[in-house]
């Protein structure tokens, strides 16, 4: 089947990095500068991606593969193939429309990206809070109150400071 296809369609012989040039009797012509073809038998070459602004070039475009971008310092990639660059925030913050905002009480973010998430609810596993949570760190759960020896004690987190809707641990 492959042989009959190549007899019928001379373009199928054009390798990656070339295109089948209809204007030149279906000759395999090399991709022009700033374009590529990653598979054989293509009738056109694709324009190389350009990494501009907050994007920087991670891998240069070649005749057979597209350029790859990442983000300049202070930004990180989002989406397939780094289609967007999103601003970094500090630990203990999350990105909103207005920029980086501190995590609300009862939530934390230990990374420079992503959203603030709630402290672990220790009581779900029958445990108690050993170390209180902060904006940057989750709570540390310890043994359940029943497991503690008479002299030991566990830390109880402060009551939510009027932050709406937080379910205290």
């Amino acid at each position: 089947f492959e042989r009959t296809r190549s007899l019928q369609d001379p373009c199928s012989n054009c390798p990656a990095g070339t295109f089948c040039d209809n204007n030149r009797n279906q000759i395999c012509s090399p991709c022009p500068p700033n374009s590529f073809s990653s598979a054989g038998g293509q009738r056109t070459c694709d324009i190389c991606r350009q990494c501009k602004g907050v994007f920087r070039t991670r891998k240069e475009c070649s005749s057979t593969s597209n350029a790859e971008c990442d983000c300049t310092p202070g930004f990180h990639c989002l989406g397939a193939g780094c289609s967007m660059c999103e601003q970094d925030c500090k630990q203990g913050q999350e990105l909103t429309k207005k920029g980086c905002k501190d995590c609300c009480f009862g939530t934390f973010n230990d990374q420079k990206r992503g959203i603030c998430r709630p402290w672990t609810n220790c009581s779900l596993d029958g445990k108690s809070v050993l170390v209180n949570g902060t904006k940057e760190r989750d709570v540390v759960c310890g043994p359940s109150p029943a497991d503690l020896s008479p002299g030991a004690s566990s830390v109880t987190p402060p009551a939510p400071a009027r932050e709406p809707g937080h379910s205290p641990q």
Partner: antibody, heavy 121, light 111 residues
């Protein structure tokens, strides 16, 4: 592809409880908030609360504290909402929805199909 | 407490342009993103506009979103209105990043 599949309609008597489920597929369940939203027939949308399945941390709207309880089973990628002490006021559609991990004020990108809870004696 | 106010109902004619409003009662409309959902009867909401003015894949470019800080409002504009646009439209924003707020919804009737 991402899907949120909710359990079937519920008919309950006043004073009883119902447990609604929301089974997630097509993404990492522990890395996104699941929100629960109430809609009475012909009315608007009302935030009940949300859960971070990764650690079971929860938030509740003031109106729903003591009414709703959220849990999540990571082994089956399912979020649950228990509605207690039911009254006719709890008769509504209940939706679960996912919020992307993009920004703190982001939209709900996927919704469950909704489940109708009817409270009647 | 943050409230988003939408007109209860709006009527428009086929192929016309309609602009639905969502007014924030306190604070600044620019503080948090505004999102718009469409809901047909008996269905779950679907996103029409997110992050003020972005359109998800598959949503016709007849739909657009905007913010007007002078009126402290967000707007959903639908050009060349079609019969399938007959639905309820909800706006959605935040009071704090853990407290989402919805508008009451606008029932759009296409005549």
């Amino acid at each position: 592809q991402v899907q949120l599949q909710q359990s079937g309609a519920e008919l309950a008597k006043p004073g009883t409880s119902v447990k609604l489920s929301c089974k997630a597929s097509g993404y990492t369940f522990t890395s996104y908030y699941i929100y629960w939203v109430k809609q009475r027939p012909g009315q608007g949308l009302e935030w009940i609360g949300n859960i971070w399945p990764g650690n079971g941390g929860t938030f509740y709207g003031e109106k729903f504290m003591g009414k709703a309880t959220f849990t999540a089973d990571t082994s089956s990628s399912t979020a649950y909402m228990l509605l207690g002490s039911l009254t006719p006021e709890d008769s509504a559609y209940y939706f679960c929805a996912r919020r992307p991990d993009y920004s703190g004020d982001d939209y709900f990108d996927y919704w469950g199909q909704g489940v109708l809870v009817t409270v009647s004696s | 407490q943050v409230v988003l106010t939408q007109p209860k109902s709006v009527s428009t004619s086929l192929k016309s342009t309609v602009k639905l409003s969502c007014k924030l009662n306190s604070g600044n409309i620019g503080s948090y993103y505004v999102h718009w959902y469409q809901q047909h009867a008996g269905r779950s909401p679907t996103t029409m506009i997110y992050r003020d003015d972005k359109r998800p894949d598959g949503v016709p470019d007849r739909f657009s979103g905007s913010i007007d800080s002078s009126s402290n409002s967000a707007f959903l504009t639908i050009n060349n209105v079609q019969t399938e646009d007959d639905a309820i439209y909800f706006c959605h924003s935040y009071d704090s990043t853990i407290t989402p707020v919805f508008g009451g919804g606008t029932k759009l009737t296409v005549l």
